[in-house]
Each structure stands twice: as structure tokens, then as C-alpha cells.
Amino acid sequence: STTKCTVSHEVADCSHLKLTQVPDDLPTNITVLNLTHNQLRRLPAANFTRYSQLTSLDVGFNTISKLEPELCQKLPMLKVLNLQHNELSQLSDKTFAFCTNLTELHLMSNSIQKIKNNPFVKQKNLITLDLSHNGLSSTKLGTQVQLENLQELLLSNNKIQALKSEELDIFANSSLKKLELSSNQIKEFSPGCFHAIGRLFGLFLNNVQLGPSLTEKLCLELANT
């Protein structure tokens, strides 16, 4: 192999190698590929054709600004996709449309300021969605009920100012257990905001300046679930 990746037990570690493109000489039977801390700007779908057995792909800490929807067409078994610390700013309906088997999607520390339309609507198996450390101003992730198997929604360190029932009720059929909202500037809990997610096990609000009246409002809304 010309690439200095380490391969062991179907796991390829290609991290910290200053790679500018996906290696094309790794064993075709790898199931885990770590490409973190490189200089990747794109993930051409064609480059993953030979790695169709991947169940986990970690491309964190690169400079990826756009994803080709065809990527997941080449990776039909992919369960974990980690894109943390990249330069993604927009997600479209097509971005993850073929990533139907994902159980974990990590998008923390990108530049996503708004979720438009329904980019996660095909993720029927998703358990963990991490959108922390972005620029999101609301919890709106879609326009229809979806993400029926989601258990963890991580939204800490964003710019969320209000929790609204019309944004959170897309989770009406989901089994959301953990909602992480720490380090946001929450100033409002609108009536019925927790109605659709009443089975929450943990609501995390560390470093959120609640104050007495907002705390009372929060308790009232939680009591009404």
C-alpha cells in the first residue's frame, strides 16, 4: 500500500496524514475508515466504490464544504457517519437521502445556521443526531413527522432562543430520550413545547441562563407532558 494508513481487522486508520484525497489502495473489505485530521475538501462518491462494506466512516476535522448525495449510494451498509469539524453550511433534502441505514450522524462544529426542508426524513434508523456547535437559531429540523427511532438529539452550543411546539412535534412518533440544549440562549418555552416529546429521560440545560420566571415556565411545560 502506498498510503501510510494502518490497517488491522478490517479497520483502516488514515488519520493525521495530510491527505487531500481518499486513498484508492486500501483493502476492499474494510468496514471502518478513519480519515480524520486530514485536508479533504470533498468526498467524491466514486472514490468510495471499492469500499462498499463500510459501516463506519469518520471524516472529522477536514475542510469538507459539500457532500455528494451519491456517497451513501456507494456505501449501502453505512451506519455511522462522522462529519464533525468541517465546513458544511447547507443541507438539502438530497444530502443524506441515500443514507437510509445510519444510526449515528455527527455534524457538530460545522457552519449550519438553518435546517431547510427535510434533510433527515430518510433516516428512519437514526438513533443519535449531533448538531452541536453550529449556528442554529431554532430547533426546526423538518416540516413533517420523522426520525421515528431517534433517541439522542444534541443541540448544545447553538443560538437557539426558544423551544416551540411546532418545531419539536416532528418527533411525535419518535422515542427521544435525550435532548441536549446546553449553552444556548433560551429565553422562551412556548406552550406545549414538550408535548410531542413527553417521554424524555434527560433534558440538558447546562450554561443556560434560566432565571426564576423562565425556570417556572419550564417546570410548568414539563409538568404538562
Epitope: D93, N117, Q144, E166, N173
Partner: antibody, heavy 122, light 107 residues
Amino acid sequence: QVQLQQSGPGLVKPSQTLSLTCAISGDSVSSNSAAWGWIRQSPGRGLEWLGIIQKRSKWYNNYAVSVKSRITINPDTSKNQFSLQLNSVTPEDTAVYYCARYSYPFYSIDYWGQGTLVTVSS
Amino acid sequence: QSVLTQPPSVSVAPGQTARISCSGDNIGSYYVHWYQQKPGQAPVLVIYEDSERPSGIPERFSGSNSGNTATLTISGTQAEDEADYYCSSYDDPNFQVFGGGTKLTVL
């Protein structure tokens, strides 16, 4: 097989309210897998989207900017239908009005009503 | 996706291939649907989600979408395909944006 049956007057006077109803069979207006809306087509013109309603834990609507101040779309769950109300009509609102079912997840219209020609004239 | 632009008319000889374009800024990032409308009738969905064909729609209808242009292709065009064709997409909060429509004439 889903069917949409429209009803309502074909003639409305200027400044009055246009009211149409769309009765649904083969599906539920409260479905979690579809949305419902209205489109119109002025004589010799293209299709113009007017608005949509969809149910999550509550009902939500979205209206076209061009009619936003005048339009209301309401569900009637007891009769499994939905309605269109367009206030303060003018002759420019003369058109064939269609009700429609939008299929999730990407809002293609897979079923249309038969269309109702509404003329606005005194 | 606020504006979708279609050619007003397209002509094709019977048996030939007709292509109807629908252009819009970065339309390739959105799903496009195509509707066929014959005079005096309600529209009919012929292609959804760029390239999917509803049951009952002939195989000669196909679609593609990338960059700034979506295309409806009718291979081996038949006289019965003469109609108006509309492209459509959605972009919250405008749940439907239609193109201006293209009149397909089968010569």
C-alpha cells in the same frame, strides 16, 4: 384508491368570499404521511400554488405570499374533508381551482380533485 | 427555489425524443416533480423526485436533475403525449413552486 371530490359555487361576486370544499375518500385528512392543498389555474395561464395544510400534533398551514392576507385552509376531521376560503375576491381570482394531496416526503402531488371553475363577476 | 423557468413550447416529431428543461438556481439540490396536463383535465404526476415514475406512467417518460437544470425526457414520443408539462419543486415555506409550463406539440 384515493379520490378527491370538490364542491362549491362556480360564481362569486367581487369583494365576497370564495368557498370550496374537498372531500377525501381512501385516505384521512389527519394522515401523518400526506398533506393537503389548493392550486389554481387562471384561463390560459399556468398553475399557481395557493396553500397547504398538514397535521403533526397540531395543524399547520403555509400560504402563498400572493394570497396570504386573504386565504384560509381548514380541515374538517369529522367529515374527512378540507376547505378553501378566499376573501375579498376580484375578477383576477377567476380560475379553475384544484384541491390536491401532497405525498411525503418531498411534496409531489399524487392525487388531484377534478377542478372547479370559479368566476368572479357581478 | 423561488423561480423555475421552462421554455414556452417544444415541438417533436412522432417517435422522436422530446426534452423539456426546467431551470432554477441550484435546482439539482432540490427534488423536482413533473406534471402533464391535457386540455380540460386536471394535471397528472408523470415523474416525481427527479426520476421516479408513478405506476401507470409509460417507461418512455424519464427525468434527470443536476446543477441548474432538470429535464423531462419523453423517448419515442406519441401523439397522446401532446399536452402542457409543468415542473415543480418545494422549498419551505413555499411548499410548491411551479414552472411556467411548456406546451409540447407532436408534429
